[in-house]
Amino acid sequence: ELCLYDPPEVPNATFKALSYKNGTILNCECKRGFRRLKELVYMRCLGNSWSSNCQCTSNSHDKSRKQVTAQLEHQKEQQTTTDMQKPTQSMHQENLTGHCREPPPWKHEDSKRIYHFVEGQSVHYECIPGYKALQRGPAISICKMKCGKTGWTQPQLTCVDEREHHRFLASEESQGSRNSSPESETSCPITTTDFPQPTETTAMTETFVLTMEYK
């Protein structure tokens, strides 16, 4: 089941997935002036490797067919070298079964990657430089199924200006530690939802159908 919407944004924080669940799809998007090869529209996480490698080729028509064919022939070779690109693995991210690592960069890719996450995917939040975390729970958001719909849980993270950090800590202590809101009950009321409402800019799954078509 694909996740509707994007994970929630937290002010002065940024998030990313540290690994990707089996079934995750990544669109092969190229920057202006380049286009993806017709055969390589997306990559899919299968087991713990990606199904193929995205490739971008110049829009200028002086590229001969030979070059494109040569690129395709090198695909298999590229897939084997991808694993050699990471000489060190951090402790928290061994290659888990059913998880893929971030695909390495490809030439002339678009600056923004469009992922289509699946149920159970988690993303990890960190405060951006200049801000410190006031944490009341895990700084993660998980795509969960609730009442037949997918949605992202709210990360328990507040990022405050590090120059003001001590002030926030002092006020937290004087108020006593507040518990983060408990998980809501399993019943499915018609009018409410447990998930934060997505912003207008968040991508719905319908976009997936459009972006998957070869331009």
Partner: nanobody
Framework: QLQLVESGGGLVQAGGSLRLSCAAS????????IGWFRQAPGKEREGVSY????????YYINSVKGRFTISSDNAKSTVYLQMNTLKPEDTAVYYC???????????????????????WGKGTQVTVSS
């Protein structure tokens, strides 16, 4: 396959300077943090410095602040590390690395410190003699 190619390493006397370059032909800088790690003999690899391709935010490990400067030339797909007032303890193999930015084109230094990068160069040796 996109590759990172380092150059500029060498032997220098304490107090001297070196400028390292990392060429990443075809890399879309706007989507990545790009920078330098180093590994001295018998020590763990450590993240020295990075610059974000989105807005040019920079980070330095405490021991090099004020001595090292990172910069990038997006048109040339190259990142530079200007190393001044070098010390014998700067002796190490210096590796260029890239890591995908997080949401909204932002990056957290904790990710750099974790050392879990998306792509690595082969490294260039820097030796500072006393």
């Amino acid at each position: 396959q996109l590759q990172l190619v380092e150059s500029g390493g060498g032997l220098v006397q304490a107090g001297g300077s070196l400028r390292l370059s990392c060429a990443a032909s075809g890399l879309t800088f706007e989507g990545y943090a790009i920078g330098w790690f180093r590994q001295a003999p018998g020590k763990e690899r450590e993240g020295v410095s990075y610059i974000t391709g989105s807005d040019g935010t920079t980070y330095y490990i405490n021991s090099v602040k004020g001595r090292f400067t990172i910069s990038s030339d997006n048109a040339k797909s190259t990142v530079y590390l200007q190393m001044n007032t070098l010390k014998p303890e700067d002796t190490a193999v210096y590796y260029c690395a890239v890591d995908r930015l997080g949401s909204q084109g932002r990056y957290a230094s904790a990710w750099w410190r974790s050392g879990d990068m998306d792509l690595w160069g082969k490294g260039t040796q820097v030796t500072v003699s006393s």
